[in-house]
Interface confidence: low
């Protein structure tokens, strides 16, 4: 699987999950998040050669098409597969609130 | 929606579904498919600016991050959202077989 266990331990040029730390205030302008100050959102990048973690029949077809027609602009793209939530603390007035934001952390990628 | 109805009628630079005809024999080397000779597989392409058909909270975050940090390499990617099957005719020996291949035709795209 193109997950953090594999991708963070290997120098992988093709589609893989990459570490990306986001500071809520500095990178997003989100003043409202009290804790954490930031988090590892991660992201997916890298080429999607034929059959690499193909998501659907279409991505398999497109990967093959791209291999046989290298000048073509149509090719699968490396995108998130498994995502995890992030728990944040913020305030409504002086009242602390804890909320789980869904799909915030990329754990693995696929070619779609 | 970034679907064929919208995308095929507009000159849209951002993420949208694009027409792509694939000839089974010439483009894929699939000699085994008898009918159809080819089909519109279509594909997704175009930049994913902040909030454009964002698939998850992560793609929203990444889009905003990319907007505020334009030098960053991390950005959402335009990929298939809705796919439709394709019915094909092929032969096993002299026996014709009809089969529906799932997820063969891209009908709409999203930023993931």
């Amino acid at each position: 699987a193109l997950d953090t266990n594999y991708c963070f331990r290997n120098l992988e040029e093709n589609c893989c999950v990459r570490p990306l730390y986001i500071d809520f205030r500095q990178d997003l302008g989100w003043k409202w998040v009290h804790e954490p100050k930031g988090y590892y959102a991660n992201f997916c990048s890298g080429p999607c050669p034929y059959l690499r973690s193909a998501d659907t029949t279409h991505s398999t077809v497109l990967g093959l098409y791209n291999t046989l027609n290298p000048e073509a602009s149509a090719s699968p793209c490396c995108v998130p597969q498994d995502l995890e939530p992030l728990t944040i603390l913020y305030y409504v007035g002086r009242t602390p609130k804890v909320e789980q934001l869904s799909n915030m952390v990329v754990k693995s990628c696929k070619c779609s | 929606a970034l679907d064929t109805n919208y995308c095929f009628r507009n000159l849209e630079e951002n993420c949208c579904v694009r027409p792509l005809y694939i000839d089974f024999r010439q483009d894929l080397g699939w000699k085994w498919v008898h009918e159809p000779k080819g089909y519109y597989a279509n594909f997704c392409s175009g930049p994913c600016p902040y909030l454009r058909s964002a698939d998850t909270t992560h793609s929203t975050v990444l889009g905003l991050y990319n907007t505020l940090n334009p030098e960053a390499s991390a950005s959402p990617c335009c990929v298939p959202q809705d796919l439709e099957p394709l019915t094909i005719l092929y032969y096993v020996g002299r026996t014709p077989k009809v089969e529906q291949l799932s997820n063969m035709v891209v009908k709409s795209c999203k930023c993931s």
């Epitope: 997003l28 302008g29 003043k31 609130k97 | 909030l51 929203t60 905003l64």
Partner: antibody, heavy 120, light 106 residues
Framework: QVTLRESGPALVKPTQTLTLTCTFS??????????VGWIRQPPGKALEWLAH???????SYSTSLKTRLTISKDTSKNQVVLTMTNMDPVDTATYYC????????????WGQGTLVTVSS | DIQMTQSPSSLSASVGDRVTITCRAS??????LNWYQQKPGKAPKLLIF???SLQSGVPSRFSGSGSGTDFTLTISSLQPEDFATYYC????????FGQGTKVEIK
């Protein structure tokens, strides 16, 4: 596609209470970080922010109008309601509702506005 | 409350001109500054957010700069459709709009 539409009376009498409804589609106020705000614009004058409500029912009001304003939401109906008490002719304006995404602090989608005239 | 002061309040320009509008905050607002364009009878349209980030779909001739208390909106080459009123908005503490700058045809 995000759309917002304001509705309410075109004419109110002085001292009456104005109730405006913003009906929206293309997003949900149950989504973390989502907000809807109200802004008004008297004829030929500048924009003035009135109030805001967020997905978590956090509300904020313009300091100068805080005692007259109440904002609420009905998530299931995709509606936000603004009430303004003790209307005066100086409150004659076009009232807009607009979406604020993820507390980013700006309004990226607006309704077309509804003109409210205060007159006896 | 934070006050936003725009200058000039109006200006006359020709197609192709470079136009600059400034906005000054009464206290430090970091980069929590947005710009909107409004045409008569229409709702405002977001142009720039976070002081310098171009909203999706907005032509690249629009640009924003500044931080702290002083901000600028620049139209590098004025087009016929750019004649409108422009507003700045601070969101550092609550929301405040500037009084607007009307860009008219010379």
């Amino acid at each position: 596609q995000v759309t917002l539409r304001e509705s309410g009376p075109a004419l109110v009498k002085p001292t009456q209470t104005l109730t405006l409804t913003c009906t929206f589609s293309g997003f949900s106020l149950s989504t973390s970080g989502m907000g809807v705000g109200w802004i008004r614009q008297p004829p030929g004058k500048a924009l003035e922010w009135l109030a805001h409500i967020y997905w978590n029912d956090d509300k904020s009001y313009s300091t100068s109008l805080k005692t007259r304003l109440t904002i609420s939401k009905d998530t299931s109906k995709n509606q936000v309601v603004l009430t303004m008490t003790n209307m005066d002719p100086v409150d004659t304006a076009t009232y807009y509702c607009a979406r604020d995404f993820y507390y980013s602090g700006y309004f990226d989608s607006w309704g077309q506005g509804t003109l409210v005239t205060v007159s006896s | 409350d934070i006050q936003m002061t725009q200058s000039p309040s109006s200006l006359s320009a020709s197609v192709g001109d470079r136009v600059t509008i400034t906005c000054r905050a009464s206290q430090d607002i970091s980069n929590y500054l947005n710009w909107y364009q409004q045409k008569p009878g229409k709702a405002p349209k977001l142009l720039i957010f976070g002081a310098s980030s171009l909203q999706s779909g907005v032509p690249s001739r629009f640009s924003g700069s500044g931080s702290g208390t002083d901000f600028t909106l620049t139209i590098s080459s004025l087009q016929p459709e750019d004649f409108a009123t422009y507003y700045c908005q601070q969101t550092n503490t609550m929301n405040t709009f500037g009084q607007g700058t009307k860009v008219e045809i010379k």
